[in-house]
């Protein structure tokens, strides 16, 4: 008796963060013995969709021609071979942007900051939201969440960075999200360019998960620092 079938690989093209109205293709790759592929969406009746494999039978395509709120969520896929169903794939989180108007991103006291000083990125929404996300372009782990507790909603979140080093420089955007679903994000804010001066002398910080770095170098997650400005907001990092 062979062991359990290996789990398939699940991914989305062109990516897992899709603007409203754009197309996305979800791929599930199993083995050459696969006879059928099944895609399940969390909190939806299973199976969410079934597809026959594409030649040479080791993967299946699930097409979403126009991204809407209904498609945002957490997916897993399985394949069936002559010996039964596989283990589930690792989850794929399909996120839709454009669910809400864009927030406003600014830097306090200024987007021009001297190395070693402090700066706070402020993401503001004109309507109350319960999650704010800060994203740095070209960062390996770009997300920092500020999520409100107990459903209390806020108009803003602060992302402090201290001390600032050269690696904090770059282009940032923020998103906001409502309690309806954390897979639904706002339009992105306009980009904010953070410029760090005096950076030639800056040593590159070690890639430890130090709470002293608020939006750290490309090889570490963005990390929070300081106290939360609104007591209803709780920090999460990924």
């Amino acid at each position: 008796q062979a062991g359990p079938l290996p789990k398939p690989t699940l991914w989305a093209e062109p990516g897992s963060v899709i603007s409203w109205g754009n197309s996305v293709t979800i791929w599930c790759q199993g083995t050459l013995e696969a006879r059928e592929y099944r895609l399940d969406k969390e909190e939806s009746p299973a199976p969410w969709d079934r597809q026959n494999p594409l030649e040479p039978k080791n993967k299946a395509r699930f097409s979403i021609p126009s991204m809407t709120e209904d498609y945002a969520g957490r997916y897993r896929c399985y394949y069936r071979s002559p010996v039964g169903w596989s283990q589930p794939s690792d989850p794929l989180e399909l996120v839709m942007t454009g669910a809400y108007s864009k927030p406003t991103l600014s830097a306090l006291p200024s987007p021009l900051v001297t190395s070693g000083k402090s700066v706070t990125l402020l993401c503001q929404s004109r309507s109350p939201m319960d999650t704010f996300l800060l994203i740095k372009e070209r960062a390996a782990h770009p997300l920092l969440h500020l999520r409100s507790e107990h459903g209390a909603q806020q108009h803003q979140a602060e992302f402090p960075m201290s001390p600032v080093t050269s690696v904090h420089g770059g282009t940032y955007r923020c998103f906001s999200s409502h309690g309806f679903s954390h897979y639904l994000l706002s339009h992105p804010s306009d980009p904010l360019e953070l410029i760090v001066s005096g950076s030639l002398e800056d040593p590159r910080p070690s890639p430890t998960r130090s709470v002293s770095t608020a939006a750290g170098p490309e090889d570490q997650p963005l990390m929070p620092t300081g106290s939360v400005p609104h007591s209803g907001l709780r920090r999460h990092w990924e």
Epitope: W20, G21, Y100, S101, R126, F180
Partner: antibody, heavy 120, light 110 residues
Framework: EVQLVESGGGLVQPGGSLRLSCAAS?????????ISWVRQAPGKGLEWIGS?????????YYATWVKGRFTISRDNSKNTLYLQMNSLRAEDTAVYYC???????????WGQGTLVTVSS | DIQMTQSPSTLSASVGDRVTITCRAS??????LAWYQQKPGKAPKLLIY???TLASGVPSRFSGSGSGTEFTLTISSLQPDDFATYYC????????????FGGGTKVEIK
């Protein structure tokens, strides 16, 4: 030309209903804006009625005094916003404006207004 | 709730005068305050946004200042075209608001 044009105003009896339209041109209502309805009774100040988010979810918020009598909706395919008004009273007599909230959080674009008169 | 209180409600002034209108928010609105000018029978016109930034095409005699809860609109030298009603407005949108506008200030000829 970027503009908002209201229509649908007129004379209505107390207790009646009316639907106002706000047609957007030169920009898309499904882009990243909020749109508000604002009214002004004769000789009075500006009064916010409510707003709808142009994001796909279309969140709406209303002034506390609305109490379910008014509903804001939109039709992206027609690039048009609506204000459904029910159980109208004499004190709802006003010029009704739709206005766009720009990136600066201010109302940077206004329609010309449409007059609603509630009278028997 | 955020209440916007404008003062004075009426202001009598002459051409060339320096005019100041105040708007007070019942809680901090940061810098998210706008000022509008309205003339009879017309829609309001945006003058100033983000408390102090002049909207496109607005004469430089108009200026705005303030942050948090206290804001001011100043007309440095009143012109004949400036006799109108002025409103302040905060930029937040939520479900516990009675209004987002102040009560208005009518600037009339002395």
């Amino acid at each position: 030309e970027v503009q908002l044009v209201e229509s649908g105003g007129g004379l209505v009896q107390p207790g009646g209903s009316l639907r106002l339209s706000c047609a957007a041109s030169g920009f898309s209502l499904s882009s990243s804006y909020w749109i508000s309805w604002v009214r002004q009774a004769p000789g009075k100040g500006l009064e916010w009625i409510g707003s709808i988010d142009s994001g796909s979810v279309g969140i709406t918020y209303y002034a506390t005094w609305v109490k379910g009598r008014f509903t804001i909706s939109r039709d992206n395919s027609k690039n048009t916003l609506y204000l459904q008004m029910n159980s109208l009273r004499a004190e709802d007599t006003a010029v009704y404006y739709c206005a766009r909230h720009g990136d600066n959080w201010a109302l940077d674009l206004w329609g010309q207004g449409t007059l609603v008169t509630v009278s028997s | 709730d955020i209440q916007m209180t404008q003062s004075p409600s009426t202001l009598s002034a002459s051409v060339g005068d320096r005019v100041t209108i105040t708007c007070r928010a019942s809680q901090s609105i940061n810098q998210w305050l706008a000022w509008y000018q309205q003339k009879p029978g017309k829609a309001p016109k945006l003058l100033i946004y983000k408390a102090s930034t002049l909207a496109s095409g607005v004469p430089s005699r108009f200026s705005g200042s303030g942050s948090g809860t206290e804001f001011t609109l100043t007309i440095s030298s009143l012109q004949p075209d400036d006799f109108a009603t002025y409103y302040c407005q905060h930029g937040y949108i939520r479900g516990d608001l009675d209004n987002v506008f102040g009560g208005g200030t009518k600037v009339e000829i002395k």
